[in-house]
Amino acid sequence: SGTTNTVAAYNLTWKSTNFKTILEWEPKPVNQVYTVQISTKSGDWKSKCFYTTDTECDLTDEIVKDVKQTYLARVFSYPAGNVESTGSAGEPLYENSPEFTPYLETNLGQPTIQSFEQVGTKVNVTVEDERTLVRRNNTFLSLRDVFGKDLIYTLYYWKSSSSGKKTAKTNTNEFLIDVDKGENYCFSVQAVIPSRTVNRKSTDSPVECMGQEKGEFREI
């Protein structure tokens, strides 16, 4: 069913990183516009991105209300200039998205090494606790606030003068590692949610090396 000269949206895809969540679809509209609706499994439909010619819709504001809920979206197609027109079944053409559970599926964004500090033969490496768009009591929560101990970080580190990497793990945002005195080291971190089976890992952070601005060196 559907309206003459409109085509249903297809390839509905969730694109989500650190809970910033956008629904994308095809095709680019020709003489038609789209409206998106989103709901939880048990909730009411809420309309977003009314009569748009875009092929994406930012649904972050809706999904951050409860990131552990499972959401479904649908994209309605309307003829341009005649949005009241409906199909033979009495409603416009639409297509459903796959289900999406933000807590389980949002991609982990590339982490950033906030700082590192050497004290003798120990180095403390701190990972930036990135702010998300998830809110509680009118404040934005960090990635650690949202995921708690479900989120770990893996540190990769190596002597600047060699290629042999080592790793350490933490379920906080800090590492304390042993290093050889007088050697410079490079660091990269990766965020991981071990309990997931998909989207478990972020990409690696940019590499930071000792002897550059970000760190601090204290000889004890």
Epitope: T154, T167, K169, N171, P194, T197, K201
Partner: antibody
């Protein structure tokens, strides 16, 4: 069902090389690192290293650097452990194991390598 | 490298008894510790992770405790199938080291 399938026993001569496969199935291969563990007869377990199948990045136990090389073939979801310049010290059972980050949750059945002339 | 010292290397016990195995890490590993069981000719099988968490499908007679550098593993009310080898492992810092193992023997 997660399965890590290793090849049968290998008998090789000193000085030779061997490449042991570990075929993974039942999960998304690129989501988990693959680790390799050595167990000499009647002895404990020794971690050789791990590989990230997504990008091929490897971490080695320094003890096995130059002895072991870890690779993957994403298209066949198979991890490989290559051991070179074999000596009798390399006679052992070699296990692949899926790395859950907090632990190794699934293990291959092990491949017995015997180095003998 | 972090050394994992596991004691005892072997222990004799009777059916229905309890046994405790200890693992000492040479430096703090928080709760990054796993315990595995290995039957003869088989691959290791996870029993405990994160020092105290029981893996899926593992009987409740197995338990783990500890944090930092000292960890314990307890089997209460030993069953016939428990008389095999046990290993601790730290997945905290590479190289991920194992304890020397404990072989449980039937008295």
């Amino acid at each position: 069902e997660v399965l890590l399938q290793q090849s049968g026993p290998e008998l090789v001569k000193p000085g030779a090389s061997v490449k042991i496969p570990c075929k993974a199935s039942g999960y998304t291969f690129t989501e988990y690192n693959m680790d390799w563990v050595k167990q000499s007869h009647g002895k404990s377990l020794e971690w050789i290293g791990d590989i990230n199948p997504n990008n091929g990045n490897t971490i080695y136990n320094q003890k096995f650097k130059g002895k072991a090389t870890l690779t993957v073939d994403k298209s066949s979801t198979t991890a490989y452990l290559e051991l070179r310049s074999l000596t009798s010290e390399d006679t052992a059972v070699y296990f692949c194991a899926r790395d859950h980050d907090y632990y190794f949750d699934f293990w291959g059945q092990g491949t017995t390598l015997t180095v003998s002339s | 490298d972090i050394q994992m010292t596991q004691t005892p290397a072997s222990q004799s016990a009777s059916l229905g008894e309890s046994v405790t195995i200890t693992c000492l890490a040479s430096q703090t590993i928080d709760t990054w510790l796993a315990w595995y069981q290995q039957k003869p000719g088989k691959s290791p099988q996870l029993l405990i992770y994160a020092a105290t968490s029981l893996a899926d499908g593992v009987p409740s007679r197995f338990s783990g405790s500890g944090s930092g550098t000292k960890f314990s593993f307890k089997i209460s009310s030993l069953q016939a199938e428990d008389f095999v080898s046990y290993y601790c492992q730290q997945p905290y810092s590479s190289p991920y080291t194992f304890g020397g193992g404990t072989k449980l023997e039937l008295k």
